[in-house]
Each structure stands twice: as structure tokens, then as C-alpha cells.
């Protein structure tokens, strides 16, 4: 390190030190001062520092502080928002996949179901997607319309197949037939929990995540006040007032500053704590009917379970129906 | 502007976005990110001694500032900050957060509610027995595996994994359906799911 | 450990020109803002001149401005002072220091005196 330098009679040293946050000289005094302006790096003696200096530092000073946070949290905001990021996109794949293991699963086992089962199945991932993202959906809704649209196609296509195109009227007597006579069993219930659960849970993972983005920027982009200015001047600068150019501060008045001027943020540690705590409780729970992978890799199989089922009773089911929508379809026949 | 916005005065950790090589679940991924998050659970606590370790602090020098005067490293004087006549510390700490930082505050606690809500623990929900009517059905509780995989002719059995690999390999993709000519038929009856998604390191 | 090893001083005639080397190790260089000081003899400390971490903005005192030129190569981790129509008042000896914060200094190096006379 450089000697201490001689004491300074000219202000010659802070002039220069100062033309480093500052270009122009007007605001450094020629000569020491007594300083009875300043309201941050109070003099013992004569001062080579102005109320203009005081303020420039002031100002740094903040400036350093914010910066100081955001090389802080930098780490942490990365790690949240690429994980975000890379789940949002995992879980628009797993909902395309299982889209495509659904209209597989038509197009091998029921190929006469394809093209109108292929626009339900696609209508129902779309909801299912809008979902996880935030949409106001209720899955029960989503999962009875799935069910409500496929199977006057089953009726007409499967079972029934010597009917003419279906008509509006007996398709909304099937649909209603549907729910009455719960003609797919208990299949539709057991979609529509594994579903809505694996959903809630994933969707809640996200903006929990995006909760975590959001706590990071705002704590990122605090406004250090005037008060926290003022000590962290007399901290880092006060001393080129005195000609002291390379002395640090004390640890422990470090440390004292820090606690003052960060008073604020650190309220959030407890909630912060428990955030990653609650989320991990989460993530552990995230499996079986919990896990939308899990769940929603696998609903192809469920729906052929409950098409079979349909089957299984088909002939029950074509006397009661036929017998439940007579009236629409004698309209139809007409 | 003497003061340059882009200087980061903390050693920037080269974060890189890795690609594994391995299969690699959701799920692993998801316990992946909470290891990781675990060792920020100090983070706003560990705030100021952390900024005083990435700024300068007396450590190695005799004498330091204690915001008034130089004074010597270990003496009393250089714990005493100097702030009398200044503002009150405590004061500053008194005022509590701003209001930015008491509605981030309240968001946590709402998010907190929720992901405690959703975290209770899960008996089974789901009675195994399906059909009321007695009919025989697909059989499939909430905590069985074979559940996924199939029944019947034709069916494809998946594999269920999501592979984070830097190519994107589907098999099948039937996004267009209706009237597409062009569909691939999974070969073996097998789909699996890959993707091209980085492994965040 | 941070350590600044300055070179490239010596005697040079009133006129002339010298090219200075600080060569950083121990820390992140091309993250830290860097600046030359230099102390006359028998007297205090002075700022020269400055430049960001990306080396995209430099600064200088006004005695210097338009003869010295500050420069860094990151990938060398080395940082320079180009000094040309030195003067007498230019004896000096030559300081390399690390910025932790905007113009507050945490490392210097050890300094290469620079002569100017005929």
C-alpha cells in the first residue's frame, strides 16, 4: 500500500478523489474549511468537504447499495427464474404428450371415434393447460365436458351404429343420459380427482415460483432511504473528507450499518423461511395423484378403461337409452 | 456519468445451463431446484453480513474508520459508529418495511397458507371399489402404478418420464389430427417423451 | 488473495511516453471497475483516471485528460495506462487499484515509480 501520505494544506489530494464520482472541481474547496454546512461527515477541524460533496457521496453511496443487492440476489433470481421457466415448458409438454397418448389410443382402438374424438381430447387439454397457467376453469367442468361430448360419438359410432348422423336433440339427450345413468361407471369421478388434484398442486407450484421471482425483483429494486444514505456516506466516504483515501470501515460499524439500513428486508426472513419450507413440504407430496405427470401420462388409459366399460355394458345401456331418448329420436327418424 | 452502472462489485458466479445425460424425472428435477433453494433459506437474514463481506472492511489493516475518526482495529472505538447526533438506529429500525417490501410480505403469507393447505397429509381418497353397480371395472386406486399402461389390444404402453436431453425426439405427434394423413403410428405401441429441456446448474 | 502487480516505470524524457501494466489475479477481474493513482513525491495521493469493469467507460482527472489513455484486457486479466507528453509534474510513483465500490478502494498494488526528466 502506498505511505500515508503527508497532511494535505491544499485539499489538492480530495479534489483529485473526488474528480472520480464528479468531473469538475467547483464544488471542493481550495483549502480546509470549517465545514458548519455539512450534515453527514461532521468535522473535528477544518474539512475538505461541502454540503454539494456531501451530497454527491450521499447519492454514490445509494447507488452502491443497490448494487451491492442485486450482485446479492443474483444467484438466487437465476436459479428461480430458469427453474420457472423450464418447469412452465415441462409441463406444456407432458399435457402435449398426453394429448398425443390420448388421440393414439383413439386412433389404435377406435379409429370410427378419431376425428370428433381427437377435437374433445384437444378441447379438454387446452383447458387443462389454461389451468396450470392461472385460468379460472373448474376441472370438474372440463373432465364432465370431455365425457358429455364423447360419448354420444360412442352411442352412435359404437354402440349403436345403425343410426343416422346424429342430430342435435338426441345428442343432448345422450349427454344428459350420460350423467343419469353414469354410463362410464365411476371412471369419470376417478378422472376428475386425480385430475383436479395433480392440477391444484401443480398450478400452486408454479405461482409459488413466480411468487419467489416476484419477491426477489422487489427486495432487488428496494429505494435505500435518506437515513441509510447518510450512514452509509459516513461509512464508505466520510473519511476522503479528512484526506483518509485508503482506510476501510471497522467490520462491526459495518455490520451496524447493514442491520439499519436493511431493517426492512430482513422482516421478510421468516415468511421467506417458511416459503421454502412449505414448498419443499409440497414437493414431497407432488407424486401418485399428486404428480400431473403421473396422472396425466396416464389418463389415455383410464379413458380406454372407460370406453370398455361402456362396452362391457352396452346392451343394458342401449335398452334404457333407447327407451330414455325415444322421443328424440322419433323426431330424428321423422 | 462517473459511476458505472454495470460493475458488480461480487465475483459473478458463471452460471451455466448444463444438459444431463441421464433420464431425468420431473420430479427429480423438482426436488433438485429444493436442495438448492434450501441453501438460500438464510438469504435475507444473511443480507448485511453479506454485503459487508463483499465491500470493503477493515480485515488485515491496524487501523480502520469507525465513521468518525481512524481508530485502532480491536479498540472499543471502532465498534462505536459514530451516528449520535446523526439519527438513532434504532429509530430507522422502528419504522418498519416499506410498503413495496409489507405486500410482498403479505403475498408470502398467502402463498405460505396455500402450500401448507395443499401440503395436509392425504389419506386415501379414492375408494378402490369404482363401479357402485358392480360391474367389473378398470380397477385402479389413487396409489397404484400399473395404472398407467394399459388394458386391452392395441394399447401403448408409456414410458413415463420426461428426459431433459438436448434433442427433441417424439415419436408421435398428432397435434393436428383431424384430417392429418401424415400421422406417425408408434412403433411397438410404445411412446416415449423426450425433450430438450437444460439442466439448470 | 487479491494481488496488483504494477510495471512498466522508469525514466523517460519530458515528451516522452511510457506504457504501464497491472497485472490482477485472486479475484473476478472483468467485474470490478479499476483505476491508476499515483503519489508525487512528498506529497498526497492523486486519482488519474478510471474504467468500468466491461471496459467500456473510462474517466480521467482533468490533469491528465488527452495525453493518458486507460485500457484493460480481460481475457489477460491485465490493466493499462498508456502515458504520452509526459511532463515533469508526472513523476510519480504509479499505484493500480481495485475498486470495490464506485470510487472507494479495497487493493492497491505496490507501485512503479515513473521518472520524467531531462
Known amino acids: 500500500q502506498p505511505p500515508p501520505p503527508p497532511p494535505d494544506a491544499t485539499c489538492h489530494q480530495v479534489r483529485s478523489f473526488f474528480q472520480r464520482l464528479q468531473p469538475g472541481l467547483k464544488w471542493v474547496p481550495e483549502t480546509p474549511v470549517p465545514g458548519s454546512d455539512l450534515q453527514v461527515c461532521l468535522p473535528k477541524g477544518p474539512t475538505c468537504c461541502s454540503r454539494k460533496m456531501e451530497e454527491k457521496y450521499q447519492l454514490t453511496a445509494r447507488l452502491n447499495m443497490e448494487q451491492l443487492l442485486q450482485s446479492a440476489s443474483m444467484e438466487l433470481k437465476f436459479l428461480i427464474i430458469q427453474n420457472a421457466a423450464v418447469f412452465q415448458e415441462a409441463f406444456e409438454i407432458v399435457v402435449r404428450h398426453a394429448k398425443n397418448y390420448t388421440n393414439a389410443m383413439f386412433k389404435n382402438n377406435y379409429p370410427s371415434l378419431t376425428p370428433q374424438a381427437f377435437e374433445f381430447v384437444g378441447e379438454f387439454f387446452t383447458d387443462v393447460s389454461l389451468y396450470i397457467l392461472g385460468s379460472d376453469i373448474n376441472v370438474d367442468d372440463m373432465v364432465n365436458e370431455l365425457f358429455d361430448s364423447l360419448f354420444p360419438v360412442i352411442y352412435t359410432q359404437l354402440m349403436n351404429p345403425g343410426l343416422p348422423d346424429s342430430a342435435l336433440d338426441i345428442n343432448e339427450c345422450l349427454r344428459g343420459a350420460r350423467r343419469d345413468l353414469k354410463v362410464f361407471g365411476n371412471f369419470p369421478k376417478l378422472i376428475m380427482t386425480q385430475v383436479s388434484k395433480s392440477l391444484q398442486v401443480t398450478r400452486i407450484f408454479l405461482q409459488a415460483l413466480n411468487l419467489g421471482i416476484e419477491v426477489i425483483n422487489t427486495t432487488d429494486h428496494l429505494k435505500f432511504s435518506k437515513d441509510c444514505g447518510r450512514m452509509l456516506t459516513r461509512m464508505w466516504y466520510c473519511s476522503y473528507c479528512q484526506g483518509l483515501m485508503m482506510v476501510k470501515p471497522c467490520g462491526g460499524y459495518c455490520n451496524v450499518v447493514m442491520q439499519g439500513c436493511m431493517a426492512g428486508v430482513v422482516e421478510i426472513d421468516k415468511y421467506w423461511r417458511e416459503y421454502i419450507l412449505s414448498l419443499e413440504e409440497l414437493v414431497n407430496g407432488m407424486y401418485r395423484i399428486y404428480d400431473m405427470e403421473n396422472v396425466l401420462l396416464g389418463l389415455f388409459s383410464t379413458i380406454h378403461d372407460s370406453i370398455q366399460y361402456v362396452q362391457k355394458n352396452a346392451g343394458k345401456l342401449t335398452t334404457t337409452i333407447g327407451k330414455l331418448c325415444a322421443h328424440s329420436q322419433q323426431r330424428q327418424y321423422r | 456519468s462517473a459511476y458505472y452502472p454495470e460493475d458488480l462489485f461480487i465475483d459473478k458466479k458463471v452460471l451455466k445451463v448444463a444438459h444431463v445425460e441421464h433420464e431425468e424425472t420431473l420430479s427429480s428435477r423438482r426436488r433438485e431446484l429444493i436442495q438448492k433453494l434450501k441453501s438460500f433459506i438464510s438469504f435475507y437474514s444473511a443480507l448485511p453480513g453479506y454485503i459487508c463481506s463483499h465491500s470493503p472492511v477493515a480485515e488485515n489493516d491496524t487501523l480502520c474508520w469507525n465513521g468518525q475518526e481512524l481508530v485502532e482495529r480491536y479498540s472499543q472505538k471502532a465498534a462505536r459508529n459514530g451516528m449520535k447526533n446523526q439519527f438513532n438506529l434504532h429509530e430507522l429500525k422502528m419504522k418498519g418495511p416499506e410498503p413495496v417490501v409489507s405486500q410482498i410480505i403479505d403475498k408470502l403469507k398467502h402463498i405460505n397458507q396455500l402450500l401448507r393447505t395443499m401440503s395436509m397429509p392425504k389419506g386415501r381418497v379414492l375408494d378402490k371399489n369404482l363401479d357402485e353397480e358392480g360391474f367389473e371395472s378398470g380397477d385402479c386406486g389413487d396409489d397404484e402404478d400399473e395404472c398407467i399402461g394399459g388394458s386391452g389390444d392395441g394399447m401403448i404402453k408409456v414410458k413415463n418420464q420426461l428426459r431433459f436431453l438436448a434433442e427433441l425426439a417424439y415419436d408421435l405427434d398428432v397435434d393436428d389430427a383431424p384430417g392429418n394423413s401424415q400421422q406417425a403410428t408408434p412403433k411397438d405401441n410404445e411412446i416415449s417423451t423426450f425433450h430438450n429441456l437444460g439442466n439448470v446448474h | 488473495q487479491v494481488q496488483l502487480v504494477e510495471s512498466g516505470g522508469g525514466l523517460v524524457q519530458p515528451g516522452g511516453s511510457l506504457r504501464l501494466s497491472c497485472a490482477a489475479s485472486?479475484?473476478?477481474?472483468?467485474?470490478?471497475?479499476m483505476s491508476w493513482v499515483r503519489q508525487a513525491p512528498g506529497k498526497g495521493l492523486e486519482w488519474v483516471s478510471a474504467?468500468?469493469?466491461?471496459?467500456?467507460?473510462?474517466h480521467y482527472a482533468d490533469s491528465v485528460k488527452g495525453r493518458f489513455t486507460i485500457s484493460r484486457d480481460n481475457s489477460k486479466n491485465t490493466l493499462y495506462l498508456q502515458m504520452n507528453s509526459l511532463r515533469a509534474e508526472d513523476t510519480a510513483v504509479y499505484y493500480c487499484?481495485?475498486?470495490?465500490?464506485?470510487?472507494?478502494?479495497?487493493?492497491w498494488g505496490q507501485g512503479t515509480l515513473v521518472t520524467v526528466s531531462s
Open positions: 487499484a481495485k475498486e470495490a465500490l464506485t470510487g472507494v478502494f479495497d487493493y
Open positions: 485472486g479475484f473476478t477481474f472483468s467485474s470490478f471497475a
Open positions: 474504467i468500468s469493469g466491461s471496459g467500456g467507460r473510462t
